[in-house]
Interface confidence: low
């Protein structure tokens, strides 16, 4: 069974998938569609790297542009380095400015909904 066929079989169960499953899926050439991606748990999407999301979505990665103001895409963008987002060529804005450090302060993030940044 190839990646696409496997994805079709598990698609209906993906809404609650944890980050680990999404990372594994990104290695299987599944080409997840945007509608499915938008239904994923925000907390599962946030830890994914730009490269992992690109692999997970395949040709559908371009759909991120249309969804950049909606969750979970909006929140995921806020967690990515702008440099990394730029490699997608989508014109996605709102990433962590180049030269900033990301402090993984869980309480701060839980309160504000965004990562704590230290300036250059």
């Amino acid at each position: 069974m190839n990646g696409s066929e496997y994805f079709v079989k598990i698609q209906s169960f993906l809404g609650g998938a944890p980050t680990e499953d999404l990372k594994a899926l990104s290695q299987q050439n599944v080409s997840m569609d945007l509608a499915t991606f938008m239904k994923l748990r925000t907390d599962a999407v946030l830890p994914l790297t730009v490269a992992e999301v690109q692999k997970l979505l395949g040709p559908h990665v371009e759909g991120l542009k249309a969804e950049e103001r909606h969750r979970p895409v909006r929140d995921w963008i806020l967690r990515q380095r702008q440099d990394d987002l730029d490699t997608l060529g989508l014109g996605l804005q709102g990433g962590i400015p180049n030269g900033y450090l990301v402090l993984d302060l869980s309480m701060q993030e839980a309160l504000s909904g965004t990562p704590c940044l230290l300036g250059p």
Epitope: S4, K65, L88
Partner: antibody
Framework: QVQLQQPGTELVKPGASVKLSCKAS????????MHWVKQRPGQGLEWIGN????????NYNEKFKNKATLTVDKSSSTADMQLNSLTSEDSAVYYC?????????????WGQGTLVTVSG | DIVMTQSQKFMSTSVGDRVSVTCKAS??????IAWYQQKPGQSPKALIY???YRYSGVPDRFTGSGSGTDFTLTITNVQSEDLAEYFC?????????FGGGTKVEIK
């Protein structure tokens, strides 16, 4: 005005390699994937793969993984495709076609194509 | 890989008539389909994206329809300049794949 310059013809010997170029102008080179498509005389179109000029990342059709290597030179806005170990099966027209990530993924623009003839 | 099948290799029509070129995908591709026109000795030209949206500059006699696995490109009021080969292409998943093409001939 989007323009894609490809050399008209390349005559190569069996077993040799050839590097095809596609010089782009009229748009932001790093904002567009560059795709390559093969068309044998009187036959259909085959997608070879694409390359992201921002980071050099690429996707290949499995069939061409050991045949084609896609690269870019950002400084000259040129995409290259190297074909190795050429045989008569590789005699074809090769097109480059950019597509803006974040927009519709059909190929609105095509190069004029390079006719590669493999002949001893 | 997703196989795109254009079962009719040739179609014959007359100026002013209507012709429908069909394309079938081996699995569901939603509306992630494009159509191209290729005239002899020329590069392909994009006509339709997302199954039914015309590229700018494409005459409105070209219309695309369908979703899932079955797609149609319809040319109404066929003109002599429509003599060409027409290809469908899916961009739902890698590798991107094309149909084998349908040549439209003018009687």
């Amino acid at each position: 005005q989007v323009q894609l310059q490809q050399p008209g013809t390349e005559l190569v010997k069996p077993g040799a390699s050839v590097k095809l170029s596609c010089k782009a102008s009229g748009y932001t080179f790093t904002s567009y994937w560059m795709h390559w498509v093969k068309q044998r005389p009187g036959q259909g179109l085959e997608w070879i793969g694409n390359v992201n000029p921002s980071n050099g990342g690429s996707n290949y059709n499995e069939k061409f993984k050991n045949k084609a290597t896609l690269t870019v030179d950002k400084s000259s806005s040129t995409a290259d495709m190297q074909l190795n170990s050429l045989t008569s099966e590789d005699s074809a027209v090769y097109y480059c076609a950019p597509h803006y990530i974040g927009s519709r993924p059909g190929f609105a623009y095509w190069g004029q194509g390079t006719l590669v003839t493999v002949s001893g | 890989d997703i196989v795109m099948t254009q079962s009719q290799k040739f179609m014959s029509t007359s100026v002013g008539d209507r012709v429908s070129v069909t394309c079938k995908a081996s699995q569901n591709v939603g509306t992630n389909i494009a159509w191209y026109q290729q005239k002899p000795g020329q590069s392909p030209k994009a006509l339709i994206y997302s199954a039914s949206y015309r590229y700018s500059g494409v005459p409105d006699r070209f219309t695309g329809s369908g979703s899932g696995t079955d797609f149609t490109l319809t040319i109404t009021n066929v003109q002599s300049e429509d003599l060409a080969e027409y290809f469908c292409q899916q961009y739902n998943s890698y590798p991107l794949t094309f149909g084998g093409g349908t040549k439209v001939e003018i009687k």
